[in-house]
């Protein structure tokens, strides 16, 4: 009987392994090379969200596209061989310490030459997968004393963003103190980036499990060759049927003038590290970019007058400095930027249970999506957070918060 | 019923400067994205700018031609689109027209107004 | 910039001939043209918009077809009031170009 492997089917090196088909039979299946994927490994990622990390890899997107990050002493694109070793060998042992959360690494006969004994609460070939859900109620306190002085230094000190560091102390999670503070399933946030549907973690207050439980999940990002073009057509008066997508920012609006508003409810408050003539000369690119990573349309708040509510923030000065210097015009460092959201598509398209109800989950969501390092987006956000009431007067916004 | 009305035109030296107004109304005029356009005498159309919502930050592009002298500003509580035109050549004698980016197409045009360059 | 270039500049007709006219654009605009009609005096009137599309209120017997860098706006049966100039119109990207024009006078 021929394998149905002869044929060679994997495309870009991925290897092939027959496996049990439909009815008895054979069929096979393709293991890809990393940035491939697909059941040939026929198409390319071109970010994150398609590219197939190990379970406990991180992704990160690089100039060059989405690549694993591998942990230390693993390497290649699906971070199973050492550095150095010959391609597609995968003879990661106990030597490249390839067991995560604690467990412990024992040698083993057969590839991958080591088997792993879990910590509690772990369990997968490299201990990457949370067991069900632990007895303990809570997440671990923060475990490195050094971190309680690391917080709120408006840096992210990666060995500090944990639940039980709060994250960097909001550093890592634009301070959001806890983006999964609703959820009532414990480990959601571990869950949140692995590119897989997990149930309990897909309502609202779980953040809808970073859409992997959507339809289409692992394609759900604006095509490369539409993002440039619906950032510039975006919110421009005709309409882009290519754009007028959830994946590209629902073209602004500009193929529904005919549907009635539908605003989630409070102000979406963010603070961007461009001063407001600099934000505004790329508010079409800022807008589309947002409402395509949040899949709904975001808009400027206008004041009274009918101007976008986008106002000066200034550089925090210390407490210490002498009174002259500090009458002097504050610098400006970047922008009070507040925004509405607009469910009108997003609660119109066929499975509409992924909206936004109000402007703090959105909020939660960007913040959740920037401690797991998978907020892609090239504006330099300081913070963010939803306002529920009407927000403070302009002048308000001209200070520190 | 939906309506633009262009005014401001007239006689200009080289090198003076006017301002257009057009006034907009029957229908939202802060949502709605808004064109310029001028025609030479006996001459085709050309296309001069355009001036987003200010909920999408008011963002305006221009032609070639009229980058750097022509300014469109919007005023959504007069319901007013403006062109200010600075440095102004002979070249620039014109109709002027105002016109509503409607969803899928631009589908109502002022009347016109009359800019005229000359010394 | 994207150049529009009509064809013929102009052409005389009679009441009843099928009349056509064509825009080529200097790269693909994907189907992002209008066409729009002018008499003297008077503001241009939308026709045809997104390469095919009919405007509410505009005569059947006025039709656009193409995409990409060839367009053609047709009129099926030319009617005393049909008499005026022609523009194509790309709005795919800024700075937006219409044609030279195509006037279509009585024979």
């Known amino acids: 009987v021929l394998s149905p492997c002869e044929s060679q089917p994997c495309q870009h090196g991925g290897q092939c392994r027959p496996s049990p088909g439909p009815g008895g039979g054979l069929t096979f299946t393709c293991h890809c090379a990393q940035p491939f994927w697909g059941p040939r490994c026929e198409r390319v990622a071109r970010s994150c969200r398609e590219l197939q990390c190990p379970v406990g890899v991180p992704c990160q997107q690089t100039p060059r596209g989405p690549r694993c990050a591998c942990p230390p002493g693993l390497s290649g694109p699906s971070c199973r061989s050492f550095p150095g070793s010959p391609p597609g060998a995968s003879n990661a042992s106990c030597a490249a310490a390839p067991c995560l959360h604690g467990g412990s690494c024992r040698p083993a006969p057969l590839a991958p030459f080591f088997r792993c004994a879990c910590a509690q609460g772990w369990t997968g070939p490299r201990c990457e997968a949370p067991a069900a859900a632990p007895e303990v109620s809570e997440e671990p306190r923060c475990p490195r004393a050094a971190c309680q002085a690391k917080r709120g230094d408006q840096r992210c000190d990666r060995e500090c963003n944990s639940p039980g560091c709060g994250w960097d102390g909001g550093d890592c999670s634009l301070s959001v103190g806890d983006p999964w503070r609703q959820c009532e399933a414990l480990q959601c946030w571990r869950l949140f980036n692995n590119s897989r549907c997990d149930p309990a973690c897909s309502s609202p207050a779980c953040l809808y499990d970073n859409f992997d439980c959507h339809a289409g999940g692992r394609e759900r990002t604006c095509n490369p060759v539409y993002e440039k073009y619906c950032a510039d057509h975006f919110a421009d008066g005709r309409c882009d049927q290519g754009c007028n997508t959830e994946e590209c920012g629902w073209d602004g609006l500009d193929c529904a003038s005919e549907v009635p508003a539908l605003l989630a409810r409070g102000v979406l408050v963010l603070t961007v590290l461009l001063p407001p003539e600099e934000l505004l000369r790329s508010s079409a690119d800022f807008l589309q970019r947002l409402s395509a990573i949040l899949r709904t349309s975001l808009r400027f708040r206008l004041d009274a007058h009918g101007q976008a509510m986008v106002f000066p923030y200034h550089r925090p000065s210390p407490g210490s400095e002498p009174r002259a210097r500090r009458e002097l015009a504050p610098e400006v460092i970047g922008s009070v930027v507040m925004l509405e959201i607009d469910n009108r598509l997003c609660l119109q398209s066929p499975e509409n249970d992924h909206c936004f109800p109000d402007a703090q989950s959105a909020a939660d969501y960007l913040g959740a999506l920037s401690a797991v390092e998978r907020l892609d987006f090239p504006y330099p956000l300081r913070d963010v957070r939803g306002e529920p009431l009407e927000p403070p007067e302009p002048s308000h916004h001209h200070h520190h918060h | 019923q939906v309506q633009l009305v262009e005014s401001g035109g007239g006689l200009v030296k080289p090198g003076g400067s006017l301002r257009l107004s057009c006034a907009a109304s029957?229908?939202?005029?802060?949502?709605?994205?808004m064109h310029w356009v001028r025609q030479a005498p006996g001459k085709g159309l050309e296309w001069v700018g355009r001036?987003?919502?200010?909920?999408?930050?008011?963002?305006?592009d221009y032609a070639a031609p009229v980058k750097g002298r022509f300014t469109i500003s919007r005023d959504d509580s007069k319901n007013t689109l403006y062109l200010q035109m600075n440095s102004l050549k002979t070249e620039d004698t014109a109709v002027y027209y105002c016109?509503?980016?409607?969803?899928?197409?631009?589908?109502?045009w002022g009347q016109g107004t009359l800019v005229t360059v000359s010394s | 910039d994207i150049q529009m270039t009509q064809s013929p500049s102009s052409l005389s007709a009679s009441v009843g001939d099928r009349v056509t006219i064509t825009c080529r654009a200097s790269?693909?605009?994907?189907?992002?043209l209008n066409w729009y009609q002018q008499k003297p005096g008077k503001a241009p009137k939308l026709l045809i918009y997104?390469?095919?599309n009919l405007q509410s209120g505009v005569p059947s017997r006025f039709s656009g077809s193409g995409s990409g860098t060839d367009f053609t706006l047709t009129i099926s049966s030319l009617q005393p009031e049909d008499f005026a100039t022609y523009y194509c119109?790309?709005?795919?990207?800024?700075?937006?170009?219409f044609g030279q024009g195509t006037k279509v006078e009585i024979k």
């Open positions: 016109a509503r980016a409607e969803a899928r197409y631009r589908d109502v």
């Open positions: 029957g229908f939202t005029f802060s949502t709605y994205v």
């Open positions: 001036i987003r919502s200010n909920t999408y930050g008011g963002i305006t």
């Open positions: 790269q693909s605009i994907s189907s992002h």
């Open positions: 997104a390469a095919s």
């Open positions: 119109q790309q709005d795919y990207h800024t700075p937006f170009t």
